[in-house]
Interface confidence: low
């Protein structure tokens, strides 16, 4: 557990008066329909709020939307609906906010049935002004900004055309017809799939994958017989139909599709799916669905090439394609991921990995907590976390797990303590060491958010009744103060704070309901006066991440290095501030066999860290052997785990083997065995 010096709760002095002076109410002068909120830029304080109200009439739907803008983090809002000519905005496209601090915003308007194309409103000055533009097509998707140049936009039309703009939506050009899916890659490259015959659905598995690197002047076909494609980190993935049957396999490219390698993953049938759970420039977590409607599959982790995969976790819970998985990247500590497995008795259990999928374990039972009715042994059980799947099942879980990169080690989640996830009302638990240890933070379900890089945690009870109380903690959830932010309770709909957890402002959204009318209302609370002073050197303490055994010289070594962080003391009530940068000191570890994965054709026997040559290649390993690229079949049995920085120590070099000799199969004709397809 991270350092917590004082066990008893220190109260924040005079906090009621300080917060009352910094609580700002705004009542929105329109009827309650739906509301969407977007932050424009980082540290700008600009928020756009779009309220929409639908009245279904007999013949048509009358819609009204209003646009509001704040430039002080939500303390005050100005109605700017006139800037968009009081046009009804289509909420399904949301507000397309430009990357970084470009200040760009695109709103897509509702247009009458007979019009030639759609209409957008564009702003490039953080929504101070908007320009109306009529489109030569009806958009099917939200406008997508190029990550490299926010003037470049792409969109698909309802006619399946791929449209591109080079001047932030002023002028549009259709660069290709019959397009199913389009995505920006790096360097303003666009990848897209096209159909030749009937439609996207009819041609699924017979699509072509195209690339343009010059916004549509020239094209290259980089794949055929494509089912779908995806981008993750520096990897481009395509699922490709097999020649012989209705199965498909994953192929990987690291050069924008110029060359492809077959991934050493099982092929999947029509009813199954692949899903990229997480990817970075080093590696990828891939889920491969099991045959049949099981609701689970297997997680594989890749090598640095995205080609060789190690089985990471069996029976990984993931409902049908596009369904629910609890897979969560714990962004507050390197290498940590949480997910759920479906056990043999069909209960759902939470698993955690601290080493990027190398090993998975149950979450440690929080101290001073009782095992619930799911536990066979009352004294031995673990914490199980509610995430997307529980939310989809309409359990009493208002929020998914929360972690922030700049709030080091902090993870907040709803959970239950037993042998499996329970459907009874969950409590909120917190970890301050990236998931190694947990404590019950709040009784019952809550909404929660992290402010000031972890200096403040704010929570609101999840209730069907109107509320007027907010809870906050300045010591990472150990002690809580409550503040009544309004005399008149509101029906709470959401907490909003600036993404990145650097802000000290929180907005509480809801509506008031009287006999005849209901109105949106927001309360923005600024905690700056609670954290009166800036943090100094004495407010921080050194914390070694991933520490489990301080006596061990290698303590804290994960993926070949350890990291010491400067962390705010729990007893310090001060501001990290908007410019706070996480201070960490890495140190390289000696290599051990744990720093290597087994290359293709080798495996680790249970409870052994050595890689042993597979006696024979079967199933998808044999297919990879037959159809994989020649250079991937020469190996010494080990490969460094992606992202592992260890040096010295063990160097597990075995003799180099040419696995092509093992590529034989009775099921395939001899001429196939000699072919090497890329």
């Amino acid at each position: 557990s991270a350092p917590g010096e004082d066990e008893e709760c220190g109260r924040v002095r005079d906090f009621v008066a300080k917060l009352a002076n910094n609580t700002h109410q705004h009542v929105f002068d329109d009827l309650r329909g739906s509301v969407s909120l977007s932050w424009v830029g980082d540290s700008t304080g600009v928020i756009l709020v779009l309220t929409t109200f639908h009245v279904p009439l007999v013949i048509m739907t009358f819609g009204q939307s209003k646009l509001y803008r704040s430039e002080d983090y939500g303390k005050n809002f100005k109605d700017i609906t006139d800037l968009i000519n009081n046009t009804f905005i289509r909420t399904e496209f949301g507000m397309a906010i430009g990357p970084e601090n470009s200040g760009k915003v695109v709103l897509t308007a509702e247009v009458s049935g007979g019009s030639r194309g759609g209409r957008i409103f564009r702003s490039s000055d953080f929504a101070k002004n908007f320009v109306q533009t009529d489109l030569p097509f009806h958009p099917l998707t939200q406008m997508m900004y190029s990550p490299q140049n926010s003037d470049y936009l792409l969109a698909l039309s309802t006619e399946n055309g791929l449209w591109v703009s080079k001047n932030f939506g002023g002028k549009w050009e259709e660069i290709h017809k019959a397009v199913c899916l389009a995505k920006w890659g790096s360097d303003n490259t666009i990848f897209f799939t096209t159909y030749a015959n009937g439609s996207c659905k009819a041609d699924l598995g017979a699509l072509e994958l195209w690339r343009t690197s010059d916004l549509g002047k020239s094209f290259k076909t980089i794949g055929v017989k494509i089912y779908s494609f995806g981008l993750g980190g520096r990897f481009l993935f395509a699922s490709v139909m097999a020649d012989k049957d209705t199965t498909r396999r994953i192929h990987v490219s690291t050069d924008q599709g110029d060359t492809w390698s077959m991934a050493q993953l099982p092929s999947v049938g029509q009813e199954q799916f692949y899903s990229i759970l997480a990817a970075n420039d080093d590696m990828v977590f891939m889920h491969v669905d099991e045959p049949g409607d099981t609701g689970f599959g297997t997680i594989f982790t890749s090598d640095d090439r995205g080609i060789v995969y190690s089985k990471s976790l069996d029976r990984h819970l993931y409902t049908t394609t596009g369904g629910e998985t609890d897979f969560t990247n714990v962004t507050s500590l390197r290498g940590v991921y949480i997910t759920s497995v479906l056990s043999e008795d069909n209960s759902i259990q939470t698993m955690i990995t601290f080493d990027q999928g190398g090993r998975w374990t149950h979450l440690r039972k929080p101290e001073n907590s009782e095992c619930d009715a799911t536990a066979k042994n009352k004294n031995e059980c673990s914490l199980h976390i509610h995430a997307s799947y529980s939310i989809s099942q309409k359990l009493n879980v208002p929020m998914a797990p929360l972690s922030e990169p700049n709030a080091v080690g902090i993870v907040i989640a709803h959970g239950s303590v037993g042998d499996a996830i329970s459907v009874m009302v969950p409590d909120v638990y917190i970890s301050d060491d990236g998931g190694y240890s947990w404590t019950k933070m709040l009784e019952g379900p809550h909404y929660y958010t992290i402010l000031d890089s972890g200096g403040i945690i704010v929570a609101i009870e999840h209730s069907s009744r109107p509320i007027n109380v907010i809870k906050f903690s300045t010591d990472e959830g150990q002690c809580w103060q409550t503040y009544t932010f309004t005399r008149d309770p509101i029906y709470f709909t959401g907490l909003a704070s600036e993404p990145g957890a650097r802000s000290m402002n929180i907005s509480i959204w809801g509506f008031t309901e009287s006999f005849l009318t209901s109105q949106w209302v927001s309360y923005t609370i600024d905690f700056k006066d609670i954290l009166e002073r800036n943090c100094e050197e004495k407010d921080y303490t050194i914390w070694l991440a991933h520490s489990t055994d301080p006596e061990d010289y290698e303590d804290g070594c994960i993926l070949g290095y350890k990291e010491q962080f400067l962390r705010l003391r729990k007893s310090s009530v001060c501001q990290n501030g908007r410019d706070y940068v996480v201070t960490k000191q890495p140190s390289i570890c000696l290599c051990s066999l744990e720093d290597f994965l087994c290359d293709f054709g080798a495996y680790r026997p249970e409870n052994d860290s050595k890689c042993v040559e597979q006696p024979e290649l079967k199933g998808h390993d044999l297919e990879f052997c037959l159809y994989g690229r020649e250079e991937h079949l020469t190996t010494n049995g080990y490969r460094k785990i992606p992202g592992d920085k260890c040096q010295g120590g063990v160097n597990p070099v075995r003799e180099v083997k040419d696995l092509k000799k093992k590529c034989t199969s009775n099921f395939l004709s001899p001429e196939k065995q000699n072919s090497k397809s890329n």
């Epitope: 609701g295 369904g323 479906l342 069909n346 759902i348 066979k376 009352k378 099942q393």
Partner: antibody, heavy 129, light 107 residues
Amino acid sequence: QVQLVQSGAEVKKPGASVKVSCKASGYTFTSRYMSWVRQAPGQGLEWMGIINPVGGSTSYAQKFQGRVTMTRDTSTSTVYMELSSLRSEDTAVYYCARDPSGIAAAGPASRYYYGMDVWGQGTTVTVSS
Amino acid sequence: EIVMTQSPATLSVSPGERATLSCRASQSVSSNLAWYQQKPGQAPRLLIYGASTRATGIPARFSGSGSGTEFTLTISSLQSEDFAVYYCQQARLGPWTFGGGTKVEIK
């Protein structure tokens, strides 16, 4: 074998309270929740609520909120259901049933809910003046 | 609360024939549905859980199907001991609720 044994029949006057017990045996008492279901003469089944034997937390149907109290005694592996302010329409057979709903078994494999797999023999409660 | 509606209220079938019982939910209950059999003077007995999985010791002539809002219990060849009242029950959202029951009687 797994069984639930309930207390005997009761006759009560309107306005009184009744407390029915249900003793579990043959399995780990704290490993499963317990539901209570009642059935009025000639009528269907009506779920009253559920109790978690570990912490004693409960969830009641709205209809019985304020009148029903479910408790448990882990030392004797017994759950209790007390219904107060009795009226004639509370005349029914009251069943306890082992309910694994505490384990959120998974939906995707279409086996999310295990069903109430073991039932008590029922306790007849008659409310009459 | 979720309302469960069973039909028909009474089903007259000859021994050896097939019986099909329906259960409809007022909103989706996914697969969180169980079927019970109850004979006069006895406690209900679990037949099917998870909409389609037979409980331990239940003969193969009982089968359940459906998902979402429409569910079916089928008894492929009625035996004399199968004449009883059958209830469906959802456990998707609290409170758990039962259907009104279908009485299967001898024709």
